[in-house]
């Protein structure tokens, strides 16, 4: 089965790489614009230059193209704790990231929030914090993992998942209560 091509891909596939088919005359292949530029006017004829103009400040194109407008530069989302790693240039979008000792959590494909890496207090670091993943902690005896923090088993309620990890402690607490009833 031949995959379905969009109109634009169909038009481009008729021309050699680095060229696109003239929208008004499908016998003409025009040279695409370099990254950092956009299409101002199609080439007037075969072998003639495409009129490409440089992107204005605040916009970019990151690859060769025949776009009528440059793309708007992304803005880092301060409300999500993001910081600018590198600013937008005519041929590269803004790069956003997180501060030192933070990691990115992606809520969706194009939205991330910065959170502090867990320090594994009352536990040990099993896996170090990475760009897109929090520290993985292993808790000391008498502690269980809740929301990636090691919490004392004294905070473990019987209905919670922690009961398996804290079972000896819970039994001990029950035992002392029982012994006090004699």
């Amino acid at each position: 089965l031949v995959p379905h091509l969009g109109d634009r891909e169909k038009r481009d596939s008729v021309c050699p790489q680095g060229k696109y088919i003239h929208p008004q005359n499908n016998s003409i292949c025009c040279t695409k614009c370099h990254k950092g530029t956009y299409l101002y006017n199609d080439c007037p004829g075969p072998g003639q230059d495409t009129d490409c103009r440089e992107c204005e400040s605040g916009s970019f194109t990151a690859s060769e193209n025949h776009l009528r407008h440059c793309l708007s530069c992304s803005k880092c989302r301060k409300e999500m704790g993001q910081v600018e790693i590198s600013s937008c240039t005519v041929d590269r979008d803004t790069v956003c990231g997180c501060r030192k000792n933070q990691y990115r959590h992606y809520w969706s494909e194009n939205l991330f929030q910065c959170f502090n890496c867990s320090l594994c207090l009352n536990g040990t670091v099993h896996l170090s914090c990475q760009e897109k993943q929090n520290t993985v902690c292993t808790c000391h005896a008498g502690f269980f993992l809740r929301e990636n923090e090691c919490v004392s088993c004294s905070n473990c309620k019987k209905s919670l998942e922690c009961t398996k990890l804290c079972l000896p402690q819970i039994e001990n607490v029950k035992g002392t209560e029982d012994s006090g009833t004699t």
């Epitope: 301060k78 409300e79 999500m80 809520w107 929030q113 959170f115 929301e147 990636n148």
Partner: nanobody, 119 residues
Framework: EVQLLESGGGLVQPGGSLRLSCAAS????????MVWVRQAPGKGLEWVSH????????YYADSVEGRFTISRDNSKNTLYLQMNSLRAEDTAVYYC????????????WGQGTLVTVSS
């Protein structure tokens, strides 16, 4: 005690509009970024939109961009979601939430309001 109470959901025809509200109490509303998320039947949570503390910066998922508008009234401690040109795929339970601070989970969110888009 933090409380978030959504309202405004209901049954609407494709192409129709609804305005969701979220009444907040128990915390300083103006100090928090607020979020709308939704859960379609049998699916996971989807981030719909969020708005910064002063209502200046907003974000929309690609699926709702140009159709939904988030806003807030800090004097009324209320968050809104204006939903226009509704589609069948917008059918979901809509929740308002406070943007998490400690980690990627929601400490505070409402009970949700059901939006059904059907002819």
């Amino acid at each position: 005690e933090v409380q978030l109470l959504e309202s405004g959901g209901g049954l609407v025809q494709p192409g129709g509009s609804l305005r969701l509200s979220c009444a907040a109490s128990g915390f300083t509303f103006a100090h928090d970024v607020m979020v709308w998320v939704r859960q379609a039947p049998g699916k996971g949570l989807e981030w719909v939109s969020h708005i910064d503390r002063v209502g200046q910066d907003t974000y929309y998922a690609d699926s709702v961009e140009g159709r939904f508008t988030i806003s807030r009234d800090n004097s009324k401690n209320t968050l809104y979601l204006q939903m226009n040109s509704l589609r069948a795929e917008d059918t979901a339970v809509y929740y308002c939430a406070v943007l998490p601070k400690r980690g990627p989970w929601f400490d505070y969110w409402g009970q949700g309001t059901l939006v059904t888009v059907s002819s």
